[in-house]
């Protein structure tokens, strides 16, 4: 089993984000973008034998983890 990327805190954006609830903060360009499509429904946890963390999930599958949880794959919604 390969692990996903560890939490990348170099840009250390504070929690909570400066964005309104329907938005996510994009660290590449440092501003808020719509991310409502990304957050429902919640995906099943990956099993120990799951494939590598990057598979192109559809928006409805690409749910954000809570703060401190592992990163989840996300289509490049930008």
């Amino acid at each position: 089993m390969r692990r996903g990327p560890r939490s990348l805190r170099g840009r250390d954006a504070p929690a909570p984000t400066p964005c309104v609830p329907a938005e996510c903060f994009d660290l590449l360009v440092r501003h808020c973008v719509a991310c409502g499509l990304l957050r429902t429904p919640r995906p099943k946890p990956a099993g120990a034998s799951s494939p590598a963390p990057r598979t192109a999930l559809q928006p409805q599958e690409s749910v954000g983890a809570g703060a401190g949880e592992a990163a989840l794959p996300l289509p490049g919604l930008l």
């Epitope: 990327p5 996510c24 990304l38 289509p75």
Partner: antibody, heavy 126, light 107 residues
Framework: EVQLVQSGGGVVQPGRSLRLSCAAS????????MHWVRQAPGKCLEWVAV????????YYGDSVKGRFTISRDNSKNTLYLQMNSLRDEDTAVYYC???????????????????WGQGTTVTVSS | EIVLTQSPSSLSASVGDRVTITCRAS??????LNWYQQKPGKAPKLLIY???SLQSGVPSRFSGSGSGTDFTLTISSLQPEDFATYYC?????????FGCGTKVEIK
């Protein structure tokens, strides 16, 4: 199969225009940001532009700003690069590529370009 | 913009060798560093993202490490199909930038 197929390259005179196309298949194109990257003969890779999944935001490299326009038609699963006022130094192989990101909490982290087109050659010459 | 400096610019190695390529950023980019492989006449292929995460389908002989300004791509046992040019790329900020490549040639 996830695929990006490019077209539209060719030979063009300085000052003229050209439009490149990048047709996507095998994935939900409308969910992905897309990039253009170029590579001049024997040179480094150079990022050209990026467009949001819904075309709401666009960014350009300094060398093409004001001359090139990135756009997309999600109904046709196609990405475009309109190149105006072409210069000799725009001669390169142009690649379209898909943006690769992860969502961590409410933060989007960028992890590069995970799917690339085959490239199309643009030659600017008088 | 963030400048990425790769070294060496080229190297000669034999099948089975351990190969190490370095990439240095002009400022700290945390772990937002990706590695690509490019063969002549082909598009680049993503190998490693987020400095150390192996892209799906990439052989485990490829690995990446580093954070901040100094990064390394390692090929643990060079295979015939690994002779290519390798590029680093930062996704810390716009404009995205690439290193100028390291060409791995047959000794």
């Amino acid at each position: 199969e996830v695929q990006l197929v490019q077209s539209g390259g060719g030979v063009v005179q300085p000052g003229r225009s050209l439009r490149l196309s990048c047709a996507a298949s095998g994935f939900t194109f409308s969910s992905y940001g897309m990039h253009w990257v170029r590579q001049a003969p024997g040179k480094c890779l150079e990022w050209v532009a990026v467009i949001w999944y819904d075309a709401s935001n666009k960014y350009y490299g300094d060398s093409v700003k004001g001359r090139f326009t990135i756009s997309r038609d999600n109904s046709k699963n196609t990405l475009y690069l309109q190149m105006n006022s072409l210069r000799d130094e725009d001669t390169a192989v142009y690649y379209c590529a898909r943006r690769f990101t992860h969502l961590r909490g409410w933060y989007i982290e960028d992890y590069g370009l995970d799917v690339w087109g085959q490239g199309t050659t643009v030659t600017v010459s008088s | 913009e963030i400048v990425l400096t790769q070294s060496p610019s080229s190297l000669s190695a034999s099948v089975g060798d351990r190969v190490t390529i370095t990439c240095r950023a002009s400022q700290s980019i945390s772990s937002y560093l990706n590695w690509y492989q490019q063969k002549p006449g082909k598009a680049p292929k993503l190998l490693i993202y987020a400095a150390s995460s192996l892209q799906s389908g990439v052989p485990s002989r490829f690995s990446g490490s580093g954070s901040g300004t100094d990064f390394t791509l390692t090929i643990s046992s060079l295979q015939p199909e690994d002779f290519a040019t390798y590029y680093c790329q930062q996704s810390y900020s716009i404009p995205l930038t690439f290193g100028c490549g390291t060409k791995v040639e047959i000794k």
